[in-house]
């Protein structure tokens, strides 16, 4: 499967949509900045094999999809852009799932890297908790949008893993 090319293309499209989704000036939201602790050090210090990279990327995209599929998210963003963004993420999930099956076969897809997946889940839990604490305010969503854009571009080591042959 030609995942590196399709993934980076979809990823770029998702990032463009995410960038367009802003509704208020982020300049009014400086005081809402928050440390979400994206697990970049764990990712940077690890050479991901292809199947590992796929499963961690899948988790990141799945969590992002879940985050932007809530009622609170629907209220925060312009509907047509949100739908396009969600569709882009859904397509990425499908691509990754198809690739996993092709790479190792359905019966061999248990979580081989539970630590990394757990780190991603905890990271998204911190984001969800922050939104709840901030009562899903427009600025809180702006901060989260900026953070998701950052985490998407941080996953370079994972993308390197996509090019690797197991």
């Amino acid at each position: 499967c030609d995942l590196p090319q399709t993934h980076s293309l979809r990823n770029r499209r998702a990032l463009i949509l995410l960038a367009q989704m802003g509704r208020i000036s982020p300049f009014s939201c400086l005081k809402d900045r928050h440390e979400f602790r994206f697990p970049e050090e764990e990712f940077d210090g690890h050479q991901f094999q292809k199947t590992q990279a796929i499963s961690v990327l899948h988790e990141m995209i799945q969590q992002t999809f879940n985050l932007f599929s809530t009622e609170d998210s629907s209220a925060a963003w312009e509907q047509s852009l949100l739908e396009k963004f969600s569709t882009e993420l859904y397509q990425q999930l499908n691509d990754l799932e198809a690739c996993v099956i092709q790479e190792v076969g359905v019966e061999e897809t248990p979580l081989m890297n539970e630590d990394f997946i757990l780190a991603v889940r905890k990271y998204f839990q911190r984001i969800t908790l922050y939104l709840m604490e901030k009562k899903y305010s427009p600025c809180a969503w702006e901060v989260v949008r900026a953070e998701i854009m950052r985490s998407f571009s941080f996953s370079t080591n994972l993308k390197k893993g996509l090019r690797r042959k197991d």
């Epitope: 802003g22 400086l30 005081k31 900045r33």
Partner: antibody, heavy 121, light 107 residues
Framework: EVQLVQSGAEVKKPGESLKISCKGS????????IGWVRQMPGKGLEWMGI????????AYSPSFQGQVTISADKSISTAYLQWSSLKASDTAMYYC??????????????WGQGTLVTVSS | DIQMTQSPSSLSASVGDRVTITCRAS??????LNWYQQKPGKAPKLLIY???SLQSGVPSRFSGSGSGTDFTLTISSLQPEDFATYYC?????????FGQGTKVEIK
């Protein structure tokens, strides 16, 4: 390597216009904001304003609102600071600096080398 | 606007001395405070961000503390290259504001 490279020193007369530049390299230019800071001779640092190069949204310090214009051209990773009519009191060193926006990361972690603007008749 | 007041405005110290510079904000800014070092003819350099985080590449003799309205920059053992002017800056809200600076001179 992250770099912000500013245009060279300028000597101008009062009433003249001027546009100085700040070119970013070694990072994703649209992922960071660019701020401008003034330092008058022998004085401290004053924040003038900031731009988000991804959409050219700007914010100004009330002291500089209407006095200067901040702009950016993301296609060439360059931010600008301009004056339509310079005054002698605009004589200063002007710095651009990179800001992480709403991300939890160091503010103004990289600075340009500065552009000295001298306004004299 | 949030006013930032540094003290002292200048100090004389010797190599090896422990130096402390304070910065006070006119209202609570949490830990949204940065410290910069500037040498004559050079651009400012970020030392400490979010009150106490040491910027990458900055020697560990520099440390920052404080929260709310009162902040401190400490140089545990002053080195010859540390003679410079130091500025605090609040990062909570626009307009961003700097302290007036503290010049550290050789005694």
């Amino acid at each position: 390597e992250v770099q912000l490279v500013q245009s060279g020193a300028e000597v101008k007369k009062p009433g003249e216009s001027l546009k100085i530049s700040c070119k970013g390299s070694g990072y994703s230019f649209t992922s960071y904001w660019i701020g401008w800071v003034r330092q008058m001779p022998g004085k401290g640092l004053e924040w003038m304003g900031i731009i988000d190069p991804s959409d050219s949204d700007t914010a100004y310090s009330p002291s500089f609102q209407g006095q200067v214009t901040i702009s950016a051209d993301k296609s060439i990773s360059t931010a600008y600071l301009q004056w339509s009519s310079l005054k002698a009191s605009d004589t200063a060193m002007y710095y651009c600096a990179r800001h992480p926006g709403l991300n939890w990361a160091p503010d103004f972690d990289y600075w340009g080398q500065g552009t000295l603007v001298t306004v004299s008749s | 606007d949030i006013q930032m007041t540094q003290s002292p405005s200048s100090l004389s110290a010797s190599v090896g001395d422990r130096v402390t510079i304070t910065c006070r904000a006119s209202q609570s800014i949490g830990d949204f405070l940065n410290w910069y070092q500037q040498k004559p003819g050079k651009a400012p350099k970020l030392l400490i961000y979010f009150a106490s985080s040491l910027q990458s590449g900055v020697p560990s003799r520099f440390s920052g503390s404080g929260s709310g309205t009162d902040f401190t920059l400490t140089i545990s053992s002053l080195q010859p290259e540390d003679f410079a002017t130091y500025y605090c800056q609040q990062a909570l809200d626009f307009p961003l504001t700097f302290g007036q600076g503290t010049k550290v001179e050789i005694k």
